[in-house]
């Protein structure tokens, strides 16, 4: 007769491993007992269990509650056992020794490989700013046994690079995603996708991109020159810009302090009923943590009693 077993048995961490050991003998041959031991335990084998045809299963204290026989129906020539809830420390070499009558003793070895699913982590790169060159947006690292696959899922244009380090039968894989930051990428998702034989489905970690930028500033409100005349109510200037982080606005008058009654409300400068004193050069200063921009406009308030036209000059500066 001969023993039938597997060269390598593979199990996912936390699942049950079947360690096969089947005696294929001639008719009339019987299996008296099957002894299972850890064969790579250093000095002397570490016993797992003894399977006796008459007295049943005896499990050694170190494996109490973790070794069982497969569920019925059982073949008396089958010395296979189940190792419950496999952990990484179970990975290694196992030996079954089968005592038969009348053929004598047989032994076989198998190797148990425990697949360890990865726990991926995503680390954002340095702050992204418009105008930078190729910049690290994020890196994603996953370690498992065997090596995980790390890829990226995103609409954003970029380049990836990977590096791996092997550690015995596990491996750590790091993938980096580089891009040239632009404001259009703001709020876009960048998803790290990790695949592994021990995972039922891919693991996904999403990072939302934030790109710092500040658009050119401009001022609205002076489009219709005829509206800026003495006595007009509700006149206002609005400063237009866009940024990430959202910018703050500040209004000043270049040729003196803001006239009394002029209200600053964020990006808007509100005027009381217009007088010629409101004529002047007004500056909108836009800033965020990334940059600052200025836009200035010249306001000429028309006095209908004077026979002169109103002039408006718009000047932008950064």
């Amino acid at each position: 007769g001969e023993l039938e077993t597997s060269d390598v048995v593979t199990v996912v961490l936390g699942q049950d491993a079947k360690l096969p050991c089947f005696y294929r003998g001639d008719s009339g041959e019987q299996v008296g007992q099957v002894a299972w031991a850890r064969a790579d335990a250093g000095e002397g084998a570490q016993e797992l269990a003894l399977l006796h045809s008459k007295y049943g299963l005896h499990v050694s204290p170190a494996y109490e509650g973790r070794v069982e026989q497969p569920p019925p129906p059982r073949n008396p020539l089958d010395g296979s056992v189940l190792l419950r809830n496999a952990v990484q420390a179970d990975e290694g070499e196992y030996e079954c020794r089968v005592s038969t009558f009348p053929a004598g003793s047989f032994q076989a070895r198998l190797r148990l490989r425990v697949l360890v699913p990865p726990l991926p982590s995503l680390n954002p790169g340095p702050a992204l700013e418009e105008g930078q060159g190729l910049t690290l947006a994020a890196s994603c690292t996953a370690e498992g046994s065997p090596a995980p696959s790390v890829t990226w899922d995103t609409e954003v244009k970029g380049t990836t690079s990977s590096r791996s380090f092997k550690h015995s039968r596990s491996a750590a894989v790091t993938s980096e995603f580089h891009l040239v930051p632009s404001r259009s990428m703001n709020g876009q998702p960048l998803t790290c996708v990790v695949s592994h034989p021990g995972l039922l489905q891919d693991q996904r970690i999403t990072h939302i991109l934030h790109v710092s930028f500040l658009a050119e500033a401009s001022v609205r409100g002076l489009e219709d020159q005829n509206l800026w005349h003495v006595g007009r109510e509700g006149a206002m200037l609005k400063c237009l810009s866009e940024g990430q982080p959202p910018p703050s606005y500040n209004w000043t008058r270049l040729d003196g302090p803001l006239p009394s009654g002029v209200r600053v409300d964020g990006d808007t400068l509100g005027f009381p009923p217009l007088t010629t004193e409101h004529s002047g050069i007004y500056v909108c200063h836009v800033s965020n943590e990334f940059s600052s921009r200025d836009s200035q406009v010249t306001v000429d308030v028309l006095d209908p009693q004077e026979d002169s036209g109103k002039q408006v000059d718009l000047v932008s500066a950064s």
Partner: antibody, heavy 115, light 113 residues
């Protein structure tokens, strides 16, 4: 019987290419990480590359970008594609199986890089 | 990268006497999660491929005579041949398989005095 048999060695000029093969038998090839290790005459052992069970690959700096390891599990075969060969690559090349350390080795195939 | 350094480079020992080879790694090869040292010892005889003797620093490979033993942890390791036999004449290498790039020691040649 567990066995590894290398082939593909030979004489090649500097800058040339060579592809080594390693035929595995007697074990479940797809379940093992595999390696190439080389040894120049009278010198010590130098690790050249490794490939994991899912095709992940590893190289030392001395061969990175020039050598490519691959495997074909259906054919129980391991390969090493060597490009831009240099005189310093002259050695016996062994393929080896890894479990805890490299527990099975082939007999090696000789690569000579010379003009 | 981890550098492995063996000492001595060569060793002459009388038959039946003890031979001791040392191996030092430039950084620890002890994996804390399982308390195993990822260090192996190999024997290479002339014209033959290397043969695995010891793994996890101290576990003998199946079929290796018990006169071979390994010890040590972290960065310092020792291979001991308790009673040198004629067939033990060879070059012995240590190797770390803690992380890539894997690296070997330069080898120690053991001869009979």
């Amino acid at each position: 019987e567990v066995q590894l048999v290398e082939s593909g060695g030979g004489l090649v000029q500097p800058g040339g290419s060579l592809r080594l093969s390693c035929a595995a038998s007697g074990f479940t090839f797809s379940s093992y990480d595999m390696h190439w290790v080389r040894q120049a005459t009278g010198k010590g052992l130098e690790w050249v590359s490794a490939i994991g069970t899912v095709g992940d690959t590893y190289y030392p700096g001395s061969v990175k970008g020039r050598f490519t390891i691959s495997r074909e599990n259906a054919k129980n075969s391991l390969y090493l594609q060597m490009n831009s060969l240099r005189a310093g690559d002259t050695a016996v090349y062994y393929c080896a199986r890894e479990w805890n350390g490299m527990d099975v080795w082939g007999q090696g195939t000789t690569v000579t890089v010379s003009s | 990268d981890i550098v492995m350094t063996q000492s001595p480079d060569s060793l002459a020992v009388s038959l039946g006497e003890r031979a001791t080879i040392n191996c030092k790694s430039s950084q620890s090869v002890l994996y804390n999660s399982n308390n195993k040292n990822y260090l192996a010892w190999y024997q290479q005889k002339p014209g033959q491929p290397p043969k695995l003797l010891i793994y996890w620093a101290s576990t003998r490979e199946s079929g290796v005579p018990d006169r071979f033993s390994g010890s040590g942890s972290g960065t310092d390791f020792t291979l001991t041949i308790s009673s040198l036999q004629a067939e033990d004449v060879a070059v012995y290498y240590c190797q770390q398989f803690y992380t890539t790039p894997y690296s070997f020691g330069q080898g120690t040649k053991v001869e009979i005095k």
